[in-house]
């Protein structure tokens, strides 16, 4: 799993793209998104 900290420092990624990746993972893993 990729941590939020790592994702936020992944250069070239927009904030929406990070939200997108988190939400896709949430739909699979049912982690809480808040």
């Amino acid at each position: 799993a990729v941590s939020e900290h790592q994702l936020l420092h992944d250069k070239g990624k927009s904030i929406q793209d990070l939200r997108r990746r988190f939400f896709l993972h949430h739909l699979i893993a049912e982690i809480h998104t808040a």
Epitope: G12, K13, S14, I15, Q16, D17, R19, R20, F22, F23, L24, H25, H26, L27, I28, A29, E30, T33, A34
Partner: antibody, heavy 118, light 116 residues
Framework: QVQLVESGGGVVQPGRSLRLSCAAS????????MSWVRQAPGKGLEWVAT????????YYPDSVKGRFTISRDNSKNTLYLQMNSLRAEDTAVYYC???????????WGQGTLVTVSS | QLVLTQSSSASFSLGASAKLTCTLS???????IEWYQQQPLKPPKYVMD???????STGDGIPDRFSGSSSGADRYLSISNIQPEDEAMYIC?????????????FGGGTKVTVLG
């Protein structure tokens, strides 16, 4: 291979209800979020509903919120869309779609036509 | 709000290169989008997701003649050596999560005609 087969469409009067089904095969159904997307005759695509892998989380656009309910039975590998208080503008082909880790609507069914008319 | 704009139609000669444009609303210019292909009387098919930096991932069975690129709020789908089977509607889409609510919108689509 991923297969999604929708059923339950037909002609229904305004104000009535209809339940659509989507039978899934070729993958572990309980591992993926699923969605419904519709397309009115001669028109563009419109996202209708999304549900998480275990069914705990559901999402809807304002156009159907409170009228449509997405659900799933993972023991039957089946996705559902309960449509209440149907309107003429709900007339469309309804597609079910499966997500991947990379995208929302990676695989699509063939669709089922819903016609709301008196 | 989140809006995608596409030209309604485009025509290309057989074997030519095609470049289709999907434009995001200005305040959403950094967003990742998706491209879909819908051949006549068929369901949509996922083509690729396309990020602001032009990187993209293509769907199952999509020929490598299809590629993507980005510039500002514009997202491009390019088709090299266009073939008769590429005649279809090409639709872009974009999703976002706002305050734990999900929203997904589609562009109106560009109808591609292959001539000759």
């Amino acid at each position: 291979q991923v297969q999604l087969v929708e059923s339950g469409g037909g002609v229904v009067q305004p104000g009535r209800s209809l339940r659509l089904s989507c039978a899934a095969s070729g993958f572990t159904f309980s591992s993926y979020g699923m969605s419904w997307v519709r397309q009115a005759p001669g028109k563009g695509l419109e996202w209708v509903a999304t549900i998480s892998s275990g069914g705990s989380y559901t999402y809807y656009p304002d156009s159907v919120k409170g009228r449509f309910t997405i659900s799933r039975d993972n023991s039957k590998n089946t996705l559902y869309l309960q449509m209440n208080s149907l309107r003429a503008e709900d007339t469309a082909v309804y597609y079910c779609a499966r997500q991947t880790t990379m995208t929302y609507f990676a695989y699509w069914g063939q669709g089922t036509l819903v016609t709301v008319s008196s | 709000q989140l809006v995608l704009t596409q030209s309604s139609s485009a025509s290309f000669s057989l074997g030519a290169s095609a470049k289709l444009t999907c434009t995001l609303s200005s305040q959403h210019s950094t967003y990742t989008i998706e491209w879909y292909q819908q051949q006549p009387l068929k369901p949509p098919k996922y083509v690729m997701d396309l990020k602001q930096d032009g990187s993209h991932s293509t769907g199952d069975g999509i020929p490598d003649r299809f590629s993507g690129s980005s510039s500002g709020a514009d997202r491009y789908l390019s088709i090299s050596n266009i073939q008769p089977e590429d005649e279809a509607m090409y639709i872009c889409g974009v999703g976002d999560t706002i305050k734990e609510q999900f929203v997904y919108v589609f562009g109106g689509g560009t109808k591609v005609t292959v001539l000759g």
